[in-house]
């Protein structure tokens, strides 16, 4: 087992008021991914709704770096390379779970947090609102 | 706090041999999401690379329900509704963290797991390999 130093002010697993707390083994199991997955290849360049990847960094969070997609255009790229503004590039979003130390600086106490990330972009037909 | 029944054979937080284990608060904080976000709206129908959402359910996992995208076509849908097979619909994938009960059926003992999910689809220009 691991000898974890008890920091003052850190929650205690025996504390009855510790809210909705569970034990989590941090040895991550890779269910259907390799340890070094190819991340959606180069789709961000080849897509008709291309996107750029921006680094979202927070050392107090795990994972510390999350890559966020930002669509390059309002419209979609046609075969000739021009942008068609009759179509829309939109972000595809996904809720992901992250870990955050809570209270901060406690080595063995965490809180699950849900964040919404943009994973990539897709090209959609716009919703046209007709004015009477 | 929540009274969690102690299943026989379930790890105990005081167990010295409990591997790489930490306390995690499951009162999930939604940093930038609503509690019931509109999942990328109706993009799955309006996209030029439309997809179907398949329910992946596992009561031993948190979250127990994950929606997986499957692209409807090999090609992409044109303005006239026909499929253009000179373009490809491809899934955008994301690695996410989930919690899995370990040992199974234990209410307060989990293991972190990393899974690859398809979030949606995008339309890409194919890579053409020319044979000499």
């Amino acid at each position: 087992g691991i000898a974890i130093p008890r920091n003052s002010g850190c929650p205690n697993s025996e504390d009855k008021n510790f809210p909705r707390t569970v034990m989590v083994n941090l040895n991550i199991h890779n269910r259907n991914t390799s340890t070094n997955p190819k991340r959606s290849s180069d789709y961000y360049n080849r897509s008709t709704s291309p996107w750029n990847l921006h680094r979202n960094e927070d050392p107090e969070r795990y994972p510390s770096v999350i890559w966020e997609a930002k669509c390059r255009h309002l419209g979609c790229v046609k075969a000739d390379g021009n942008v068609d503004y009759h179509m829309n590039s939109v972000p595809i979003q996904q809720e992901i779970l992250v870990l955050r130390r809570e209270p901060r600086h406690c080595p063995n106490s965490f809180r699950l947090e849900k964040i919404l990330v943009s994973v990539g972009c897709t090209c959609v037909t716009p919703i046209v609102h007709h004015v009477a | 706090g929540i009274a969690i029944p102690r299943n026989s054979g379930c790890p105990n937080s005081e167990d010295k041999n409990f591997p790489r284990t930490v306390m995690v608060n499951l009162n999930i904080h939604n940093r930038n999401t609503s509690t019931n976000p509109k999942r990328s709206s109706d993009y799955y129908n309006r996209s030029t690379s439309p997809w179907n959402l398949h329910r992946n359910e596992d009561p031993e996992r948190y979250p127990s329900v994950i929606w997986e995208a499957k692209c409807r076509h090999l090609g992409c849908v044109k303005a006239d509704g026909n499929v253009d097979y000179h373009m490809n619909s491809v899934p955008i994938q994301q690695e996410i963290l989930v919690l899995r009960r370990e040992p199974r059926h234990c209410p307060n003992s989990f293991r972190l797991e990393k899974i690859l999910v398809s979030v949606g689809c995008t339309c890409v220009t194919p890579i053409v390999h020319h044979v000499a």
């Epitope: 290849s41 960094e57 050392p59 510390s64 890559w67 600086h105 | 690695e95 963290l97």
Partner: antibody, heavy 124, light 109 residues
Framework: QVQLQQSGPGLVKPSQTLSLTCAIS??????????WGWIRQSPGRGLEWLGR?????????DYAVSVKSRITINPDTSKNQFSLQLNSVTPEDTAVYYC??????????????WGQGTLVTVSS | DIVLTQSPATLSLSPGERATLSCRAS???????LAWYQQKPGQAPRLLIY???NRATGVPARFSGSGSGTDFTLTISSLEPEDFATYYC??????????FGQGTKVEIK
């Protein structure tokens, strides 16, 4: 399998520029699941990370604060290699320089492939 | 920068004995971003453990890693002659904070 082959001079004069190249085989410098870095090792300093480049729809450069004003790491996609330039060197920059692949899968970070190392001596 | 302090500086043991190497961080680091390397004279470091406890490809089962927060351990259950080398821990806290420990030399007693 992935291999890194380093090349460059072993002797550099003080105040000049140290230049090393790392050729990649078995992977791409533009890979979206790796970063490419330089690390040096000297008796006085131990192992010291200098910086990395990574490609995620554009090139990202990250440099250690200790060398930030003097370092440049550049990719060469046509030759599938990357280079290190360290300006205004002093004898304290004498070290064995390693290039390495940093696995960068969001959930882990570590150096799994290393070059053979190049001893660079800064002396007049 | 986060400072990683390895102890002991030198460990004198005989083949077959158990080696326990310690790495202590000056502040909390994510265990997922903690790695261990082995280095022999004249060679580049070789990855042994990543994510504090995951063995790299081809690394024998006698090597194991553990720890969280600020305290991490590399254990070699039964030393083989080829295990006598210097071992380094390394952490990644952010894109600009990546540091190595000063090393523990495991030598033949």
């Amino acid at each position: 399998q992935v291999q890194l082959q380093q090349s460059g001079p072993g002797l550099v004069k003080p105040s000049q520029t140290l230049s090393l190249t790392c050729a990649i085989s078995g992977d791409s410098v533009s890979s979206s699941s790796a970063a490419w870095g330089w690390i040096r090792q000297s008796p006085g300093r131990g192992l010291e990370w200098l910086g990395r480049i990574s490609y995620r729809s554009k090139w990202y450069n990250d440099y250690a604060v200790s060398v930030k004003s003097r370092i440049t790491i550049n990719p060469d996609t046509s030759k599938n290699q990357f280079s290190l330039q360290l300006n205004s060197v002093t004898p304290e920059d004498t070290a064995v320089y390693y290039c390495a692949r940093e696995v960068d899968s969001m959930y882990y970070s570590y150096f799994d492939i290393w070059g053979q190392g190049t001893l660079v001596t800064v002396s007049s | 920068d986060i400072v990683l302090t390895q102890s002991p500086a030198t460990l004198s043991l005989s083949p077959g004995e158990r080696a326990t190497l310690s790495c202590r961080a000056s502040q909390n680091v994510w265990a997922f971003y903690l790695a261990w390397y082995q280095q022999k004279p004249g060679q580049a470091p070789r990855l042994l453990i990543y994510g504090a406890s995951n063995r790299a490809t081809g690394v024998p089962a006698r090597f194991s890693g553990s720890g969280s927060g600020t305290d991490f351990t590399l254990t070699i259950s039964s030393l083989e002659p080829e295990d006598f080398a210097t071992y380094y821990c390394q952490q990644y806290r952010s894109t600009l904070s990546l540091t190595f420990g000063q090393g523990t030399k495991v030598e033949i007693k």
